[in-house]
Interface confidence: medium
């Protein structure tokens, strides 16, 4: 099965890397430092 991170979700993660967890069939983001949220779009103001 094609990895959705390379197609439909290739621009999903704003400040992070897209990751497809196949065994749960979910797309998630691994955020860059100081960022958080579903799409890594929120910045930690304390950082």
């Amino acid at each position: 099965k094609k990895n959705p991170c390379t197609a439909k979700f290739q621009n999903f993660c704003i400040h992070g890397e897209c990751r497809y967890i196949e065994n749960l069939e979910v797309v998630t983001c691994n955020c860059h430092q100081d960022y958080f949220g579903e799409r890594c779009g929120e910045k930690d103001l304390l950082a």
């Epitope: 990751r19 967890i21 069939e25 979910v26 998630t28 691994n30 955020c31 960022y35 958080f36």
Partner: antibody, heavy 124, light 112 residues
């Protein structure tokens, strides 16, 4: 508000079948893996099954494998548990639980919301 | 299967006092890539379980800061800094690093 409402429990004879349902609302059901967990009377919690978002992957402990089948209908926002060849030891309250992604920088999945449960009694 | 062992089985506490629950797993819960899938649930009398702590030490939404989790590898602890009346119930640790997911036997917190 996340809501999970189980139904379908009841009294059934050993060897019988039952189908449990869980109606979900307040979130995008199709985006979440889902689980069933049970609790026998005066006992602890036991994981029963988990299903992936699209239903392609399902997981069971040995205690129910081959007898129970988890499924989902994303169009109806519903989760199901088909229970066959029921035994007295399957008597329990069955909870539907969402496998929620908790975002803290990297993903993390945990059973973040639970329904109130439906009671299954297996007895002759 | 991973066996989760909790102690004590019962924990009578005085209101305002601290409380500590131990959870030990039969093998390491560290997932090389994704951290440690160790969670704590609270089940008040007559209610369904609620997620309290996830990823060993992270409090879930709305959980008071008197609850804290710690530990690593195979040994984990849930602490309540000052027990309140609403904390009465059974607490379960749970691992979801490895299938089958497993729960501890539970620790019943009651007021003396």
């Amino acid at each position: 508000e996340v809501q999970l409402v189980e139904s379908g429990g009841g009294l059934v004879k050993p060897g019988g079948s039952l189908r449990l349902s869980c109606a979900a609302s307040g979130f995008t059901f199709s985006s979440y893996p889902m689980s069933w967990v049970r609790q026998a009377p005066e006992k602890g919690l036991e994981w029963v099954s988990t299903i992936s978002t699209g239903g392609r992957y399902t997981y069971y402990p040995d205690s129910v494998k081959g007898r129970f089948t988890i499924s989902r209908d994303n169009a109806k926002n519903s989760l199901y548990l088909q229970m066959n060849s029921l035994r007295a030891e399957d008597t329990a309250v069955y909870y539907c639980a969402r496998q929620g992604p908790i975002y803290y920088g990297n993903y993390y999945y945990a059973m973040d919301y639970w329904g109130q449960g439906t009671t299954v009694t297996v007895s002759s | 299967d991973i066996v989760m062992t909790q102690s004590p089985l019962s924990l009578p506490v005085t209101l305002g006092d601290p409380a500590s629950i131990s959870c030990r797993s039969s093998q390491s819960l560290v997932d090389g890539e994704d951290g440690t899938y160790l969670n704590w649930f609270q089940q008040r009398p007559g209610q369904s379980p609620k997620l309290l702590i996830y990823k060993v030490s992270e409090r879930f939404d709305g959980v008071p800061d008197r609850f804290s989790g710690s530990g690593s590898g195979t040994d984990f602890t849930l602490k309540i800094s000052r027990v309140e009346a609403e904390d009465v119930g059974v607490y379960y640790c749970s691992q979801s690093t490895h299938v089958p997911y497993t729960f501890g036997g539970g620790t019943k917190v009651e007021i003396k």
